[in-house]
């Protein structure tokens, strides 16, 4: 089985300020085990937007079916976009264990906020 | 319905062989890592065995070498090849599913009883 | 072998109370840790995955927490229902251990 990749189809996305944002991300294999995680930014003070294993993300929903194993599509939904959500956004896919260690992270989408459309 | 059947249980002489069956319905098998599991009489739990969606397979030190674990996509069953069974094997075995993400337990069968005894 | 270790190994109470179960594990798991009722001559049933997720259709009552390697399960408002063993069991490696179980029963 070829190694897992994390794929962003997505360079930039654009969104105007109190709209929804899709960030979109899918993997290509099962293998391995373990949570996929978003996060804004890139290096340690990056900052965590969605945890598939526990957290609570109010602004966050996914896109897809994530109770079947077969699911491989990771895409978000952010709501309410504000100009402070822009950046970079990445898909970052976890290997289970005790840490959890990051596996493989897609090449980011960085987000753009256009003005509330008067 | 998510559903997983046992079957193939029985009584057995010590050296004998055995072949446990697990029929799978409401989902696809081969895109979650499964699980065996056995409960002696009046005892607790103990993981058997499981095998990977990329077929890896793995097993507790007891039964290495004498139990084979497998899957057979096209019936969607999950097996557990006995051989050189001894008295402590002796156990209700349930099969069982792995979760979506972290392979955290799920969905358990019936059971099925094995008896090994002269 | 990473070994689970619950305590008590049983416990009475009575309708109405609140209870909790310990289990302690032998190093470092992470949250990869659950929680199984099991009644007399039947299979497990799933409650708890990592540590503190409930399983779709299990009953708030039931509440699990801890990381690393102390946990504890959690039920509010015991129901006669409720009396029954339950297992801890750690799935951050293989091979996947249980706990041995804390009988719970109706006092």
């Known amino acids: 089985e070829e190694e897992l990749q994390v794929i962003q189809p997505d360079k930039s996305v654009s969104v105007a300020a109190g709209e929804s944002a899709i960030l979109h991300c899918t993997v290509t294999s099962l293998i391995p085990v373990g949570p996929i995680q978003w996060f804004r930014g890139a290096g340690p003070a990056r900052e965590l937007i969605y945890n598939q294993k526990e957290g609570h993300f109010p602004r966050v929903t996914t896109v897809s079916e994530s109770t079947k194993r077969e699911n491989m599509d990771f895409s978000i939904s952010i709501s309410n976009i504000t100009p402070a959500d822009a950046g970079t956004y990445y898909c970052v896919k976890f290997r289970k264990g005790s840490p959890d260690t990051e596996f493989k992270s897609g090449a980011g989408t960085e987000l753009s906020v256009r003005a509330k459309p008067s | 319905e998510v559903q997983l059947v046992e079957s193939g249980g029985g009584l057995v002489q010590p050296g004998g062989s055995l072949r446990l069956s697990c029929a799978a319905s409401?989902?696809?098998?081969?895109?979650?890592?499964m699980h065996w599991v056995r409960q002696a009489t009046g005892k607790g739990l103990e993981w058997v065995s499981a095998?990977?969606?990329?077929?890896?397979?793995y097993y507790t030190g007891s039964v290495k070498g004498r139990f084979t674990i497998s899957r057979e996509n096209a019936k969607n069953s999950l097996y557990l090849q006995m051989n050189s069974l001894r008295a402590g094997d002796t156990a209700v075995y349930y099969c069982?599913?792995?979760?979506?993400?972290?392979?955290?337990?799920?969905?358990w069968g019936q059971g099925t009883m094995v008896t090994v005894s002269s | 072998d990473i070994q689970m270790t619950q305590s008590p190994s049983s416990l009475s109470a009575s309708v109405g109370d609140r209870v909790t179960i310990t289990c302690r594990a032998s190093?470092?798991?992470?949250?990869?840790l659950a929680w199984f009722q099991q009644k007399p001559g039947k299979a497990p049933k799933s409650l708890i995955y990592?540590?503190?997720s409930l399983h779709s259709g299990v009953p708030s009552k039931f509440s699990g927490s801890g990381s690393g390697t102390d946990f504890t399960l959690t039920i509010s408002s015991l129901q006669p229902e409720d009396f029954a063993t339950y297992y801890c069991?750690?799935?951050?490696?293989?091979?996947?251990?249980f706990g041995q179980g804390t009988k719970l029963e109706i006092k």
């Open positions: 069982v599913r792995g979760g979506v993400w972290d392979d955290a337990f799920d969905i």
């Open positions: 409401g989902f696809t098998l081969s895109s979650y890592d």
């Open positions: 095998i990977g969606t990329a077929g890896d397979t």
């Open positions: 190093q470092d798991i992470n949250n990869y």
């Open positions: 990592t540590a503190s």
């Open positions: 069991q750690q799935y951050v490696s293989y091979p996947y251990t």
